[in-house]
Interface confidence: medium
Amino acid sequence: AIELVPEHQTVPVSIGVPATLRCSMKGEAIGNYYINWYRKTQGNTMTFIYREKDIYGPGFKDNFQGDIDIAKNLAVLKILAPSERDEGSYYCACDT
């Protein structure tokens, strides 16, 4: 079975300082899948952020960078200049 595991359950972030979220794939090669990132905010709304390759949700392209690290079997999401509005729970998902 495939499992996507966040590197950290909680990521402390400083305003304006780039932050990186990582999600590790267990049981399969990450290169065989498309990775997606979502953010869930307090109102339980799930918002699409990024999908390979270079597909971003509205308003996310300028402040987020998604990528995969084939060597480490990781999905990576960078928040370039975090602010309070970026608070929330981030989810990685995969599909073919």
Partner: antibody, heavy 119, light 110 residues
Framework: QVTLRESGPVLVKPTETLTLTCTVS??????????VSWIRQPPGEALEWLAH???????SYNSSLKSRLTISRDTSKSQVVLTLTNVDPVDTATYYC???????????WGQGTMVTVSS | QSVLTQPPSASGTPGQRVTISCSGS????????VNWYQQLPGTAPKLLIY???QRPSGVPDRFSGSKSGTSASLAISGLQSEDEADFYC???????????FGGGTKVTVL
């Protein structure tokens, strides 16, 4: 129009402290998407990143020079100051400051200031 | 010793295509985007490519960038005499919490 201008001494003696000032205009040092780096380039050599100051005043340094470097800012004067202690002739270089504008990278550079370390 | 690795030189005749490679690691190119800078003789570096493959306004479309894994490349198609310059790749490094540069590639138009 965004500009950065480096200023400081042209000649410094070995063991002295070098102080360089980067005066910026056209953007705010506290803008969340803006930050400033110092980079140097010895004659005929590659670019070397020295230090970085983020919009929230956090700093990061080149690990090999960290003990000798200090970066700070004065937002009221729109200035970023770099100090390098105990200089040596190998510190002879052109020193640049550059704005980092995310996600665009270092999109505006100063013209650079040449510093020679010699007795 | 630069963190990112570039060939020291590259050359071509006018009109030719020249490609410059840039190799890094998972903490820089592997998890961040790559920028390219052009430095004409006696001048400050200028941003040429950002976010792997994006050109700032005013940069000719003869310049293109790409990235794969922990490596990136810059291509100059239709080489012109005014392209003689040093080209540097750069990327943010998560371990250093700062940008890292390549050693630079000097492009000569024969």
């Amino acid at each position: 129009q965004v500009t950065l201008r480096e200023s400081g001494p042209v000649l410094v003696k070995p063991t002295e402290t070098l102080t360089l000032t980067c005066t910026v205009s056209g953007f705010s040092l506290t803008n969340i998407r803006m930050s400033v780096s110092w980079i140097r380039q010895p004659p005929g050599e590659a670019l070397e990143w020295l230090a970085h100051i983020f919009s929230n005043d956090e700093k990061s340094y080149n690990s090999s020079l960290k003990s000798r470097l200090t970066i700070s800012r004065d937002t009221s004067k729109s200035q970023v100051v770099l100090t390098l202690t105990n200089v040596d002739p190998v510190d002879t270089a052109t020193y640049y400051c550059a704005r980092m504008r995310l996600p665009y990278g270092m999109d505006v550079w100063g013209q650079g200031t040449m510093v020679t370390v010699s007795s | 010793q630069s963190v990112l690795t570039q060939p020291p030189s590259a050359s071509g005749t006018p009109g030719q295509r020249v490609t410059i490679s840039c190799s890094g690691s998972t903490s820089n190119i592997g998890s961040n985007t790559v920028n390219w800078y052009q430095q004409l003789p006696g001048t400050a570096p200028k941003l040429l490519i950002y976010s792997n493959n994006q050109r700032p306004s005013g940069v000719p479309d003869r310049f293109s960038g790409s990235k794969s894994g922990t490596s990136a490349s810059l291509a100059i198609s239709g080489l012109q005499s005014e392209d003689e310059a040093d080209f540097y790749c750069a990327a943010w490094d998560d371990s250093l919490n700062g940008p890292v540069f390549g050693g630079g590639t000097k492009v000569t138009v024969l």
